[in-house]
């Protein structure tokens, strides 16, 4: 058979051959960082000629070209500089907002050597919509400018850029956009392993219901996770074995898959693993229907026995057939277990597709994905039951559009990636799920099902009792620390008689803990401004209690996520370099932010935290309170910027005994504490018969109700000082 000519050098770069100079061999070019090869690859045809995939004209000289990042096509309500057609590696673009708009995202972004911008999409938002302004990523064009419930926005990419993420997003009832943020990227761009590992790991961990790879305490290392979610996980590993994958690359695919299997079996969950290799046809090496699929050693040995030569007779890339074999496996399992049974319906399915190129036979893989979604009944309610991760390796002939089409679209998560080479893939799987660091103190998880008890819905919620009577509330922020209000402690330093009542699945009355130490903010002094006619002042109204023993985590006792920590960062599914300011911008991102606190009877009540100009008008009514503040000239003397304000319109007001309790928000089905209940102008419980009776203030009440909550974003130095060894704080 003729061999292909050897005059294929690339100036400034190197090349590798999958099968020497023989027909069927794939030649892959590579360039130093910051440059990309054009063309990326050539295929040796049976005629003995090189062919460039996708090329229409005759063979051109291969060159290394400089990588560039896409320019903004449009930037709303602000300006960006400098204005270039595209940006060189290392080049910056800066964003500023017009008056009345707040910048969310990164004010300055740098073009990275992989053709991707660092940071996050900059958005100038005024918080007016039901959903935050979804922004326009660099290189994209958006149609749709209304952000109300049910409104849709559509995206496309300019010129030859490729869209990854969702081309259409809808503003949902919970104030969050459906799908995942669209990004426009150069066709030659790829992902760095250090970006992929946390993104993939976070998404995967979220699916497992266990996300806290950040505990510092030594005893948590090596401890296994008790996953709180019921049910079973089916993991399907699909390994591309087509002609363009060299034998060495296939070995790394296998090794990466083994790493994944090893990690996944370290979780205390019921898991079955399927192994499928594919080229022109799929070969099922392990089926989830086989009992051995639950046994780690059996799964790994079937992976080790996967042979590169199994597919030498059919060397195309039939991704459709590979995914269809997953569909057939699901279909058989459904028939076996019964379509209507919980045993079938409670199985979560994760598909990891490792490929090096586009499918070139067997029809559209999207069709197989549609069949899979259909058989699993994937809809908004059951979205959590399927995750498809499409990972392209070797940027040669990987089709971004196809990968993006196959990967799941979930808010704040990424499921489609392209890595430069198999070494990068290995790195990703090595760092993706470092089980040794995972613990079961996952934060901010509450049971949202209709039949859950109040304590299961807010398992961080605790009651503080000085003697026999309850006096204040608080929130577990770790397995041994409670955050509450300083004004609850007015008896000097003797807390020996105090008790903290924590939720306990074994008792409806909870479990009582003694306090090892109380750390009360030294800045708190209710009489600090008495001389100014301010009879009560609640600045620095914050305290921490260290419990005498650790709380055993359960459905009834679990910490809430504190913003500005790595634990919260994982729960928000934000990138690794996020800061405290990013958390504030994400959580308190509107003029009126819906939030909650827990009532004396344990139920969750609704409030709206007023921000920006609305904060000012919310706080202003304090000037009408003549008893507590007889000669107040400046409201800010009483309501400093340490406070969040609520109590307008239909808001519930907290009672005195609800002081110290968490003021929290829900994001991505997780809960984040942004404040703690401090003081107010109206007590709806005063003189009531019991914990279930609350009286709404009459509309004519002067002053009208207002409630003030310590803003945790303003207490960061103090929190860091005392919790630095307990939580992992992000940079401010």
């Amino acid at each position: 058979a003729p061999s292909c000519p050897q005059n294929v050098n690339i100036s400034g770069g190197t090349f590798t051959l999958s099968h020497g100079w023989a027909p069927g061999s794939l030649l892959t070019y590579s360039c130093p960082q910051g440059l990309y090869p054009s063309p990326a690859s050539r295929l040796c045809k049976s005629s003995g000629q090189w062919q460039t995939p996708g090329a229409t004209r005759s063979l051109s000289k291969a060159v290394c070209k400089p990588v560039r990042c896409p320019a903004p096509v449009s930037f709303e309500n602000g300006i960006y500089t400098p204005r270039l057609g595209s940006y060189p590696v290392g080049g910056n673009v800066s964003f500023e907002c017009e008056d009345g708009f707040i910048l969310r995202g990164s004010p300055v972004r740098q073009c990275r050597p992989n053709g991707m911008w660092d940071g996050e999409t900059a958005v100038c938002d005024n918080g007016a919509g039901h959903c935050p302004n979804p922004g326009i990523s660099l290189g994209a064009v958006r149609t749709g400018f209304r952000f109300g419930h049910g409104d849709k926005v559509r995206y496309r990419c300019s010129s030859n850029l490729v869209l990854t993420g969702s081309s259409e997003r809808e503003c949902q009832g919970n104030g969050v956009w459906s799908g995942t943020e669209p990004i426009c990227r150069q066709p030659y761009s790829y992902d760095f392993p250090e970006d992929v590992a946390p993104a993939l790991g976070t998404s995967f961990s979220h699916m497992l219901g266990a996300t806290n790879p950040t505990q510092k305490t030594k005893e948590s290392l090596g401890r296994k996770i008790q996953i709180q979610r019921s049910g079973h996980l089916n993991l399907y590993l699909l390994l591309d074995c087509s002609q363009s994958v060299s034998e060495n690359d296939f070995l790394i695919f296998k090794e990466s898959a083994s790493l994944m299997v090893d990690r996944i079996f370290s979780f205390e969950i019921n898991v079955s693993v399927a192994i499928i290799t594919f080229a022109s046809e799929p070969k099922v090496l392990m089926s989830v229907l086989n009992d051995n699929s639950r046994d780690m050693t059996e799964v790994i040995s079937s992976l080790e026995n996967a042979n590169y030569k199994d597919h030498e007779n059919g060397t195309g890339t039939n991704t459709y057939a590979a995914l269809n074999s997953v569909y057939l496996m699901m279909n058989n399992q459904m028939r076996l277990l019964g379509m209507e049974t919980m045993a079938w319906q409670e199985i979560r399915h994760a598909i990891i597709l490792l490929t090096d190129g586009k499918s070139n036979m067997g029809g559209s893989p999207k069709t197989a994905v549609d069949h899979i979604r259909e058989i699993l009944n994937i809809n908004q309610k059951r979205n959590d039951y399927l995750d498809i991760y499409a990972i392209g390796v070797g940027k040669l002939d990987v089709d971004w559009r196809e990968l993006n089409e196959l990967g799941s679209k979930k808010d704040g998560e990424r499921h489609a990636f392209i890595l430069q080479d198999t070494k990068a893939l290995h790195q990703v799987f090595e760092h993706m799920l470092d089980v040794s660091k995972l613990t079961d103190t996952i934060c901010g998880v509450g049971n949202m099902s209709a039949n859950a008890s109040d304590q299961e819905r807010t398992p961080w919620h605790v009651t503080i009792k000085p003697k026999s009577q309850e006096t204040c509330r608080g929130a577990l922020i770790s397995d041994q620390w409670v955050l509450t209000a300083a004004h609850c402690f007015r008896d000097g330093n003797d807390h020996s008689l105090w008790r903290v009542n924590v939720g306990d699945p074994k008792s409806q009355w909870g479990k009582e803990f003694l306090i090892e130490k109380a750390v009360i903010s030294p800045g708190f002094d209710v009489f600090a401004k008495k001389n100014q006619g301010i009879l009560e002042f609640y600045g620095d109204d914050i305290a921490l209690l260290k419990l005498a023993q650790k709380v055993k985590m359960s459905t009834h006792a679990r910490p809430i996520c504190l913003p500005c920590t790595m634990e919260a960062n994982l729960a928000l599914r934000r990138p690794q370099g996020s800061t405290c300011r990013d958390h504030e911008n994400e959580l308190l991102n509107k003029q009126s932010v819906p939030a909650h606190f827990v009532a004396l009877n344990g139920s969750k009540l609704n409030i709206n935290l007023k921000m920006g100009v609305e904060w000012t008008s919310c706080a202003e009514v304090v000037s009408q309170e003549k008893t507590m503040f007889p000669n107040l000239t400046d409201v800010r003397e009483v309501v400093t910027d340490q406070f969040l304000c609520s109590g307008t319109q239909e808001d519930e007001s907290p009672c005195k005994g609800e002081s110290g309790g968490a003021v929290f928000l829900e994001r991505r089905f997780r809960f984040f504490q942004v404040g703690l209940v401090s003081w107010g102008l109206y007590n709806p419980c005063l003189g009531s018969a019991d914990k279930n009776s609350r009286k709404r203030a009459p509309r004519s009440k002067v002053p009208p109700p207002r409630d003030f909550h310590i803003n945790l974003f303003r207490m960061q130095p103090w929190l860091r000082q005392h919790l630095g060894d307990v939580l992992n704080f992000l940079p401010l």
Epitope: K467, K656, N683, L686, K691
Partner: nanobody, 122 residues
């Protein structure tokens, strides 16, 4: 727990005034919200007034607002209720109560006085 003893009740004509006192024993008096409740014959016990542990904020039932004034003297461990412009419907046994949280939930209060009778009649 705080022990409470009320005094100052009696018979008074409509439009008249009375000052009720409530003496508390226990060194933690200054940490407690203090309040007054009343119970008319055949009726439920109802909230009248309360004062915060700091003395800085006070609350009144709508029916007594502008006529009654609550105050406290932490040095004497005593809380007072000054009642002016008394009406026949103010006739009741007046009880003093102490509450650490300040909500004065009837189901949770465990510090009550024995009560002092106020009769408003001509």
């Amino acid at each position: 727990q705080v022990q409470l003893v009320e005094s100052g009740g009696g018979l008074v004509q409509p439009g008249g005034s009375l000052r009720l006192s409530c003496a508390a024993s226990g060194h933690t008096f200054r940490s407690y919200y203090m309040g007054w409740f009343r119970q008319a014959p055949g009726k439920e016990r109802e909230f009248v007034s309360s004062i915060s542990w700091t003395g800085g904020s006070t609350e009144y039932a709508d029916s007594v607002k502008g006529r009654f004034t609550i105050s406290r003297d932490n040095s004497k461990n005593t809380v007072y209720l000054q009642m002016n412009s008394l009406r026949a419907e103010d006739t009741a046994v007046y009880y003093c109560a102490a509450d650490y949280s300040g909500d004065f939930l009837l189901s949770d209060l465990d510090s009550w006085g024995q009560g002092t009778l106020v009769t408003v009649s001509s």
